[in-house]
Interface confidence: low
């Protein structure tokens, strides 16, 4: 039943491109060369991309031709290295053409960067897009995947995929309609935070398979299977499991191509076998391949059985416990895994990893015990305070959030963080904290039975944000020490963090709080972050400020912009009054 | 890989007896309660009887209680299912899986009970 043994093909970019169809196969290999070469310029791309078109074609022509037989990363990597700036644009990148496969690909993928320097997406006026639109919808939709490839390097390309087709259908309908931008512009708006939370989702998987392996991958996965299809059996689970690995295996490593053909192939599996796996799955399959598999990753967790058994009996009371755990280890605890998370859809992933990580470490030590069933019979009552953590940790923070909305609930993460991580750039900070802080809005109105699933796994992805970008410039120990200790323990890692007592505050730098009547005319979002910026540095010059401190001294900030803003002389106001402010807040803060 | 082979199934007359067995591998048998679950043609998979992984507790749907007995072989790493004083509607195709799941992950085994 493995849906991925296939026969040997005599040429793989024939046998891909026949299976994808031209289109697709043109869209991924555009998304694998801008995530690659993420400076390169669109038409640069759209040529190699042409090319390699051009040469599968002869291939599908006869497989017997030359160099069709050779490997995908052969023919990518090869086309990569033709590019004439690779030295000067990349610099120690071009080293890699220096290499054989695999090492040239994976010198590829280790050059991959996860804060490209370049300019942030300004959005055109929506009849410029419009006619930009109509005028070459082919160049315009092959720009959005570029566009958002390269500024999103490990981001799912079949899910990119079908992110650009939903682009096309907002311009496509948008564009006729009688207010053009009050039909596109939410749906846009819509497209990048989803965007966003997808190019997040994945960059988790990839960094859980390429820091932590193909075990600690494959034990999320059977948690996360297990919640959403109860019902399944855990051969069926494990299948599911199996394929989904080489599927993220196959995108995180550049193998765009295998990748999405087969998501396709999964996809098409779990619907044919939606009676063994779940009752929640009839409208995903009837819909087209790219909706149907968004579909199914997002699909809602199917009801539990009715009267499953204790756990107790097969985990803890057998006298076999050790005997079967020996057998077969990891066999055991997937099993363990699978029947704990398909009892608790109300437990995050993580927190059922560490239950079975506790599980584990327990039955190495007492299968080791004179008397192992003594040792481990208690081993459930370990679980309570791991359970009761992220359960008390996210009701005091969602009482925070309902206390002080959003925006001041950023604030005292922001707050919070740079106390803990003071080194971390400032910008790092702000991204990192105000998604953090968006954890309330998304998981606070849920029940009690959801919010730990959607607070804890949803801070595990924006934490993860935040380990890529200090992976690039390491700057602080902990933050280190956090990131790469255990993966399911990032999360209690940073929360268990104090106040940094052995951080030298920043010199005082008027500079970085001398504001501009340009405030004025950014959106809300842009001026929260501004404010959001100013907190950090304030925070950075003085750690030990307290909240009311720094409560006052941003009141006195918010009310200078907005009596500023409303000034006739914008500018010579922000001059003046920002001198007093600065003065003010030194005082305040005791700089 | 987790393989469990069903075996046993037939044709058989109303009122007459079937044993079923359930060849597991790919697993530690003995750490597990196992099920049997049939799927009747035109209907969904119905949940027959369940056993722990000791073989000390039984469960029965109310359907078959009195009729049907659960039991396993950990030695030899199979699942039993001793059925009696078969009815028509017993016709099933019948599956035996992990824990108590009502989905199939096996080929199952086909019982016929004509009246």
């Known amino acids: 039943r493995g849906v991925f043994r296939r026969d040997a093909h005599k040429s793989e970019v024939a046998h891909r491109f026949k299976d994808l169809g031209e289109e697709n196969f043109k869209a991924l290999v555009l998304i694998a060369f801008a995530q690659y070469l993420q400076q390169c310029p669109f038409e640069d791309h759209v040529k190699l991309v042409n090319e390699v078109t051009e040469f599968a074609k002869t291939c599908v022509a006869d497989e017997s031709a030359e160099n069709c037989d050779k490997s995908l990363h052969t023919l990518f990597g090869d086309k990569l290295c033709t590019v004439a700036t690779l030295r000067e644009t990349y610099g120690e990148m071009a080293d890699c053409c220096a290499k054989q496969e695999p090492e040239r690909n994976e010198c590829f993928l280790q050059h991959k960067d996860d804060n490209p320097n370049l300019p942030r997406l300004v959005r055109p006026e929506v009849d410029v897009m419009c006619t930009a639109f109509h005028d070459n919808e082919e160049t315009f939709l092959k720009k959005y995947l570029y566009e958002i490839a390269r500024r999103h390097p490990y981001f799912y390309a079949p899910e990119l995929l079908f992110f650009a087709k939903r682009y096309k259908a907002a311009f496509t309908e948008c564009c006729q309609a009688a207010d053009k931008a009050a039909c596109l512009l939410p749906k846009l708006d819509e497209l990048r935070d989803e965007g966003k939370a997808s190019s997040a989702k994945q960059r988790l998987k990839c960094a859980s398979l390429q820091k932590f392996g193909e075990r600690a991958f494959k034990a999320w996965a059977v948690a996360r299977l297990s919640q959403r299809f109860p019902k399944a059996e855990f051969a069926e689970v494990s299948k599911l499991v199996t394929d989904l690995t080489k599927v993220h295996t196959e995108c995180c490593h550049g193998d765009l191509l295998e990748c999405a053909d087969d998501r396709a192939d999964l996809a098409k599996y779990i619907c044919e076998n939606q009676d063994s796996i779940s009752s929640k799955l009839k409208e995903c399959c009837e819909k087209p391949l790219l909706e149907k598999s968004h579909c199914i990753a997002e699909v809602e967790n199917d009801e539990m059985p009715a009267d499953l058994p204790s756990l107790a009996a097969d985990f803890v009371e057998s006298k076999d416990v050790c005997k079967n755990y020996a057998e077969a280890k990891d066999v055991f605890l997937g099993m363990f895994l699978y029947e704990y998370a398909r009892r608790h859809p109300d437990y995050s992933v993580v927190l059922l990893l560490r239950l079975a990580k506790t599980y584990e470490t327990t039955l190495e030590k007492c299968c080791a015990a004179a008397d192992p069933h003594e040792c481990y019979a208690k081993v459930f009552d370990e679980f309570k305070p791991l359970v009761e953590e992220p359960q008390n940790l996210i009701k005091q923070n969602c009482e925070l959030f309902e206390q002080l909305g959003e925006y001041k609930f950023q604030n005292a993460l922001l707050v919070r963080y740079t106390k803990k991580v003071p080194q971390v750039s400032t910008p790092t900070l702000v991204e990192v904290s105000r998604n953090l802080g968006k954890v309330g809005s998304k998981c606070c109105k849920h029940p009690e039975a959801k919010r730990m699933p959607c607070a804890e796994d949803y801070l595990s992805v924006v934490l993860n944000q935040l380990c890529v970008l200090h992976e690039k410039t390491p700057v602080s120990d902990r933050v280190t020490k956090c990131c790469t200790e255990s993966l399911v323990n990032r999360r209690p890692c940073f929360s268990a963090l104090e106040v940094d007592e052995t951080y030298v505050p920043k010199e005082f730098n008027a500079e970085t709080f001398t504001f501009h009547a340009d405030i004025c005319t950014l959106s809300e979002k842009e001026r929260q972050i501004k404010k959001q910026t100013a907190l950090v540095e304030l925070v950075k010059h003085k750690p030990k400020a307290t909240k009311e401190q720094l409560k006052a001294v941003m009141d006195d900030f918010a009310a200078f912009v907005e009596k500023c803003c409303k000034a006739d002389d914008k500018e010579t106001c922000f001059a003046e009054e920002g001198k007093k402010l600065v003065a003010a807040s030194q005082a305040a803060l005791g700089l | 890989e987790v393989q469990l082979v069903e075996s046993g199934g037939g044709l058989v007359q109303s009122g007459g007896s079937l044993r079923l067995s359930c060849a597991a591998s790919?697993?530690?048998?003995?750490?597990?309660?196992m099920s049997w679950v049939r799927q009747a043609p035109g209907k969904g998979p119905e949940w027959v009887s369940a056993i722990d992984g000791g073989g000390a507790d039984t469960r029965y749907a109310e359907s078959v209680k009195g009729r049907f007995t659960i039991s396993r072989d950990n030695a030899k790493k199979t699942l039993y299912l001793q059925m009696n004083s078969l009815k028509p509607e017993d016709t099933a195709v019948y599956y035996c899986t992990i824990g108590q799941s009502t989905s199939r992950g096996s080929q199952g085994t086909q019982v016929t009970v004509s009246s």
């Open positions: 790919g697993f530690t048998f003995g750490s597990f309660g």
